[in-house]
């Protein structure tokens, strides 16, 4: 198969970073004026991830129709998706208003609420104990009807009620709970099993509005999910897998939302998923059972509050010249959250050579990108960057990855400093008390 050959060749030559960089430079760039309005500052999770004006979802609200969400309309595949950021505490009502107004049946969540010790998303659906949530700003009520917890994903049946009209709708919440804190899933089996679960539910059928897909910024993992689904759909429609060009499809998708697929690693994983998924599309129905087996969905899920331990960093393939984020005091910025798809500020010049590691070029061990989380104020110490067209202007290198890479060294330094300081203080204390 063409795609498989291409995959092997890129793997062999180690050129995923270069290919990913080409995509980033070719990507569309459109205005995001509404997203940048001062009144919408607190409706954006990350300063540099905004919906394009032409494809943004508009809430049916007179005072402010803005939500950080984009409609991705794939004409040939005849599939539409709404990609959105993980809801903020102040936008949960807007999120469900969008689900209601767009007549969506499915919500796909690809992150955990808490990852790597920081909040990636508000708790926007009711947990068992609470049973229901009322969003007074949009006059909607959300009830948890049932929950099917598998080892690596959970499917929730929710009931969304418009309190004004008392109309209700069943919403299916597909929550992929085991995307690793660093990098991408080890194999595409569990991811494909999850994708096909969403498909089988009818949530993607034209009877309903577009499925709502989110991670933290709604561009990395979310892009991966939609890219894989669209490519597999096109393969099915065309009956000729070799005619599907993943890069072209991704560039088409990037006309609707910036930054889809945030790392070279995610791009590589998308290829893997499509290559594996194509086996099923081309008539090998046994592979679906294999995915199910390989994904061990019926095992006990890991405890939700204990995130999987970060993988130790692999050998860095690209020089990692990122500077880690500054600490912002006084909560002007509510922590520059790392997000499932984000990275550390790294200066990028438009024509920078690959070995200068422009932001977004990933070592094969990570997929997280830092996004500046906005509430107010400005980013101090951020370097001037000339980003790729249509690309988020702040980085995609993982600050947590950088920290984990240096952690042993830093810990030793800290311990040595503390011990030295302690010894010095003891000495001073003893010396002073003797005189």
């Amino acid at each position: 198969m063409e795609m498989e050959k291409e995959f092997e060749q890129i793997d062999k030559s180690g050129s995923w970073a270069a290919i990913y960089q080409d995509i980033r430079h070719e990507a569309s760039d459109f205005p995001c004026r509404v997203a940048k309005l001062p009144k919408n500052k607190n409706r954006n999770r990350y300063r540099d991830v905004s919906p394009f004006d032409h494809s943004r979802i508009k809430l049916h609200q007179e005072d402010n129709d803005y939500i950080n969400a984009s409609l991705i309309k794939m004409e040939e595949a005849q599939r539409s998706y709404i990609l959105t950021q993980g809801p903020l505490p102040n936008t949960c009502g807007h999120f469900w208003e969008m689900v209601w107004e767009q007549k969506s049946r499915g919500v796909v969540m690809l992150n955990r609420v808490m990852e790597k010790g920081s909040l990636k998303c508000a708790q926007y659906w009711p947990q068992k104990e609470e049973k229901e949530m009322i969003f007074e700003d949009t006059n909607l009520k959300l009830t948890l009807i049932s929950e099917d917890i598998k080892s690596y994903y959970t499917v929730r049946q929710l009931e969304l009620e418009n309190l004004t009209t008392q109309e209700t709708r069943e919403i299916l919440h597909f929550h992929y709970t085991t995307w690793p804190d660093f990098g991408v899933p080890e194999s595409p089996a569990s991811f494909l099993n999850f994708l096909f679960k969403v498909r089988e539910s009818g949530s993607l059928s034209p009877e309903h509005g577009p499925v709502v897909v989110h991670c933290s910024a709604g561009i990395g993992r979310s892009g991966t999910f939609c890219l894989a689904d669209t490519c597999l759909l096109l393969m099915d429609k065309r009956k000729d897998p070799s005619s599907v060009d993943i890069k072209k499809v991704l560039l088409e998708m990037r006309k609707f939302r910036m930054g889809l697929i945030q790392t070279a690693d995610q791009l590589r994983f998308s290829y893997l998923a499509v290559i594996e998924g194509a086996k099923f599309i081309m008539g090998d129905s046994s592979v679906q059972d294999q995915w199910k087996e390989l994904s061990h969905e019926d095992l006990e899920p890991p405890p939700e509050h204990i995130p999987p331990p970060p993988r130790p960093p692999k050998r860095i393939l690209e020089p990692h010249n990122g500077k880690c984020r500054e600490f912002f005091p006084n909560h002007q910025w509510v922590k520059e959250e790392t997000q499932e798809d984000k990275d550390c500020p790294i200066k990028e010049e438009k024509g920078s050579p690959l070995n200068a590691a422009p932001y977004g070029i990933e070592s094969m061990s990570q997929d997280t990108e830092v996004r500046s989380r906005v509430v107010g104020g400005s980013l101090r110490g951020a370097q001037a960057a000339s980003p790729a067209k249509g690309e988020p202007s702040l980085p995609e290198k993982d600050e947590d990855h950088a920290l984990s890479y240096w952690k042993p060294f830093l810990v030793n330094m800290c311990v040595a400093t503390v011990l030295t300081a302690g010894a010095y203080l003891c000495y001073r204390f003893l010396f002073n008390s003797n005189t």
């Epitope: 009830t143 009931e159 009209t165 008392q166 709708r169 009818g202 309903h208």
Partner: antibody, heavy 117, light 106 residues
Framework: EVQLLESGGGLVQPGGSLRLSCAAS????????MSWVRQAPGKGLEWVSS????????SYADSVKGRFTISRDNSKNTLYLQMNSLRAEDTAVYYC??????????WGQGTLVTVSS | DIQMTQSPSSLSASVGDRVTITCRAS??????LNWYQQKPGKAPKLLIY???SLQSGVPSRFSGSGSGTDFTLTISSLQPEDFATYYC????????FGQGTKLEIK
């Protein structure tokens, strides 16, 4: 194609009971709220009852409260209306309707209920 | 309960005419107003929902407007198949219908 097919209507004596069914097809039944609307011969339309998508919430017109019970079986794609203590004024064609976007967007062909001695 | 008053209750018109039917709510219902067409012996059919949105498959000669308490259904150029009874309905529980407007051939 969305289809709603009512059954269970007929002639019943005042004070009697009847159970109407509505078989749904061509759409994801469990996603939608459903309703019953009736129309007395030569008269206008009157909303009777609605039920939430999960079946957990119900509402009724004052004229039938305490006598009629709406229910659904999502596994069978079927909506029901249990009618007890029937009165002459309940005589009507009963329509099953899908309640979506605050409107009755699809209707069945109706089943006639006649309450007479 | 919210009362819906439709006018006129009956109306004679010719093919090609522009026809307007009005509906008034006893209190504000925002845009929760729908219009239905019913032919003798048939189930009602949704034409317009949310005051002005055209239901899929409905000809564009039908249009709706209004919000709050006053609403209008307009048929821009009457066709032979449009002669029927029209009902408005408000979408705030308990849901109520107007008494209907019978549109007849002149």
């Amino acid at each position: 194609e969305v289809q709603l097919l009512e059954s269970g209507g007929g002639l019943v004596q005042p004070g009697g009971s009847l159970r109407l069914s509505c078989a749904a097809s061509g759409f994801t039944f469990s996603y939608y709220s459903m309703s019953w609307v009736r129309q007395a011969p030569g008269k206008g339309l009157e909303w009777v009852s609605s039920i939430s998508s999960s079946g957990g919430g119900t509402s009724y017109a004052d004229s039938v409260k305490g006598r009629f019970t709406i229910s659904r079986d999502n596994s069978k794609n079927t909506l029901y209306l249990q009618m007890n203590s029937l009165r002459a004024e309940d005589t009507a064609v009963y329509y099953c309707a899908r309640w979506f976007s605050s409107a009755f967007d699809y209707w069945g062909q109706g089943t006639l209920v006649t309450v007479s001695s | 309960d919210i009362q819906m008053t439709q006018s006129p209750s009956s109306l004679s018109a010719s093919v090609g005419d522009r026809v307007t039917i009005t509906c008034r709510a006893s209190q504000s219902i925002s845009s929760y107003l729908n219009w239905y067409q019913q032919k003798p012996g048939k189930a009602p059919k949704l034409l317009i929902y949310a005051a002005s949105s055209l239901q899929s498959g409905v000809p564009s000669r039908f249009s709706g407007s209004g919000s709050g308490t006053d609403f209008t259904l307009t048929i821009s150029s009457l066709q032979p198949e449009d002669f029927a009874t029209y009902y408005c309905q408000q979408g705030v529980p308990p849901y109520t219908f107007g008494q209907g407007t019978k549109l007849e051939i002149k």
